[in-house]
C-alpha cells in the first residue's frame, strides 16, 4: 500500500492553523504597548497529488507536483504557504520613546495554499 | 514538507533552483503543440533564523520564525515559496481539436522567498 512508502500520507492537507502570538513571549513587551498579542495563525500540511480546489494551487504548483511524483529525490513538493495576509495596527515606542501607531502589513494569515 | 527530509544536514538557504520541464515527460505531448517544454524552476531551501533581506520574508514569516525557535515541535519554519511568477504562452488542441493559443499565468518561478 502507499502508506508503506509515503510517510506523508499520515499528514493532513495544507490548511490554516490557529496560532496566538504573545508579544511578551517574543520579548517585545518593552516596545510594543498594544496589543499584548494577536492571532497570527500559520500554514501547514501536505501539498500532495492531486491538488484539489481547496488548496489554492498555482499552475506552477500543479506542474511541480507532477514533476515531484516522477523525481521525488530532486524536486520537492510545493509548500503550504499563506495566500492571504492581513495587517494589524500596533502601538509602540520608537527609538526616541515617542508613542507611534503603525499598521504592519502581512501579519495575519487568512488563507493558505500550495505554492 | 521539511519533515519528509533529513534534518541533520546543513541545508542551503531558500533560493530559486533551475528546472526544465518537458511536456512529454508529463505525458502532455498529445495536446500541447508548442513549446515542447519550458524553464519552470522551483523554490527550495531553508527559512531559518535570522531571515536575511535576500529571503523576501513577510512580517508574518519573521514572526513565525521566532515562534518556531521557541516551539519547533508545534510551529514549522516558514516555507520557501515563489514570490514572483511569470506566464507562458502555450499552443494546444482543445477538446474539439481546435488549435488554441493561450497564456497560462503563474507557470515560471522568477523569485523565491520565505512565507
Amino acid at each position: 500500500s502507499a502508506s508503506d512508502y509515503n510517510s506523508s500520507e499520515l499528514k493532513t492537507a495544507c490548511r490554516k492553523h490557529e496560532l496566538y502570538v504573545s508579544f511578551q513571549d517574543l520579548g517585545w513587551q518593552d516596545w510594543i504597548i498594544a496589543p499584548k498579542g494577536y492571532a497570527a495563525n500559520y500554514c501547514d500540511g501536505e501539498c500532495s497529488f492531486p491538488l484539489n480546489a481547496h488548496m489554492n494551487a498555482t499552475n506552477h504548483a500543479i506542474v511541480q507536483t507532477l514533476v515531484h511524483l516522477m523525481n521525488p529525490e530532486y524536486v520537492p513538493k510545493p509548500c503550504c504557504a499563506p495566500t492571504k495576509l492581513n495587517a494589524i495596527s500596533v502601538l509602540y515606542f520608537d527609538d526616541n520613546s515617542n508613542v507611534i501607531l503603525k499598521k504592519y502589513r502581512n501579519m495575519v494569515v487568512r488563507a493558505c495554499g500550495c505554492h | 514538507s521539511a519533515s519528509d527530509y533529513n534534518s541533520s544536514e546543513l541545508k542551503t538557504a531558500c533560493r530559486k533552483h533551475e528546472l526544465y520541464v518537458s511536456f512529454q515527460d508529463l505525458g502532455w505531448q498529445d495536446w500541447i503543440i508548442a513549446p515542447k517544454g519550458y524553464a519552470a524552476n522551483y523554490c527550495d531551501g531553508e527559512c531559518s533564523f535570522p531571515l536575511n533581506a535576500h529571503m523576501n520574508a513577510t512580517n508574518h514569516a519573521i514572526v513565525q520564525t521566532l515562534v518556531h525557535l521557541m516551539n519547533p515541535e508545534y510551529v514549522p519554519k516558514p516555507c520557501c515559496a515563489p514570490t514572483k511568477l511569470n506566464a507562458i504562452s502555450v499552443l494546444y488542441f482543445d477538446d474539439n481539436s481546435n488549435v488554441i493559443l493561450k497564456k497560462y499565468r503563474n507557470m515560471v518561478v522568477r523569485a523565491c522567498g520565505c512565507h
Partner: antibody
Framework: QVHLVQSGAEVKKPGASVKVSCKTS????????IHWVRQAPGQGLEWMGW????????EYSEKFQGRVTITRDTSASTVYMDLSSLRSGDTAVYYC???????????WGQGTLVTVSS | EIVMTQSPATLSVSPGERATLSCRAS??????LAWYQHQPGQAPRLLIY???TRATGFPPRFSGSGSGTDFTLTINSLQSEDFAVYYC?????????FGPGTKLDIT
C-alpha cells in the same frame, strides 16, 4: 566507468544494527540519488529508501521508518545505510542503486549479504 | 500507488527459442518503464528503459515494447546466459515499485 562498490557480508544477532557502505566512482557523486533495495531469500526486490547525494535529503519506506538511516560522505563519494533492531526477517541481500533525474536505476552495487541469526 | 503485475511467474523455454514476458501497470505510466535482468549471485542489471530502449551491453535479441499500461519484453534466440529473473519497474509515479518478477527457466 561508473562503479558502485559495497562493503562485505555481515552476520548479526537479533536486536543489533548493521551499517552497509556503497562507495561510488566514475561520475559526479552529488548529481545523482542513491537508493537502497533489498532482496530476502526467495522474495522480490523491495525498496527501502533514498538519499539525494547533493543535498542529503532522504525518504524512507514506511516499512523501515525509524529503523533505517541513510547518510552520505561527499568527500568519500560514499553512501551508508544503517538498519537497526535487526530481526531474522532482515536476512537479505542489500543493494545500492544509482538514479538520475527522470531515469530508472541504471547502476547497481554488487550486493551485501546480511544474515541475522542468534 | 501503481501496482505492477508480471506474467507468467515462471516461463520454461528451450535455448534458441523466443521468450515473451509481460508486464502490466494498474494505471498509465507513459513510456517510463524499465526491465532488469537479475542473475543468481549478481546485482540486477538495467536491460531496457523508456519501455523500448536497450541499455548498453545487451545484444539486439532483447527488445521491449508497449506504452501506457501494457508492456512486453521479447528475447529472441535464447542463450544460456539469458536464463534469469526479469523484473519490470515503472518510474513515472513515485513510489517506483518493482513487479514480482518472471523467472525464465531452461526447459
Amino acid at each position: 566507468q561508473v562503479h558502485l562498490v559495497q562493503s562485505g557480508a555481515e552476520v548479526k544477532k537479533p536486536g543489533a544494527s548493521v551499517k552497509v557502505s556503497c562507495k561510488t566512482s566514475g561520475y559526479t557523486f552529488t548529481t545523482y540519488a542513491i537508493h537502497w533495495v533489498r532482496q530476502a531469500p526467495g522474495q522480490g526486490l523491495e525498496w527501502m529508501g533514498w538519499i539525494n547525494a547533493g543535498n542529503g535529503r532522504t525518504e524512507y519506506s514506511e516499512k523501515f521508518q525509524g529503523r533505517v538511516t541513510i547518510t552520505r560522505d561527499t568527500s568519500a563519494s560514499t553512501v551508508y545505510m544503517d538498519l537497526s533492531s535487526l530481526r531474522s526477517g532482515d536476512t537479505a541481500v542489500y543493494y545500492c542503486a544509482r538514479r538520475g533525474f527522470g531515469e530508472p536505476f541504471d547502476q547497481w552495487g554488487q550486493g551485501t549479504l546480511v544474515t541475522v541469526s542468534s | 500507488e501503481i501496482v505492477m503485475t508480471q506474467s507468467p511467474a515462471t516461463l520454461s523455454v528451450s535455448p534458441g527459442e523466443r521468450a515473451t514476458l509481460s508486464c502490466r501497470a494498474s494505471q498509465s505510466v507513459s513510456s517510463n518503464l524499465a526491465w532488469y535482468q537479475h542473475q543468481p549471485g549478481q546485482a540486477p542489471r538495467l536491460l531496457i528503459y523508456g519501455a523500448s530502449t536497450r541499455a548498453t551491453g545487451f545484444p539486439p535479441r532483447f527488445s521491449g515494447s508497449g506504452s501506457g499500461t501494457d508492456f512486453t519484453l521479447t528475447i529472441n534466440s535464447l542463450q544460456s546466459e539469458d536464463f534469469a529473473v526479469y523484473y519490470c519497474q515503472q518510474y513515472n509515479n513515485w513510489p517506483f515499485i518493482f513487479g514480482p518478477g518472471t523467472k525464465l527457466d531452461i526447459t
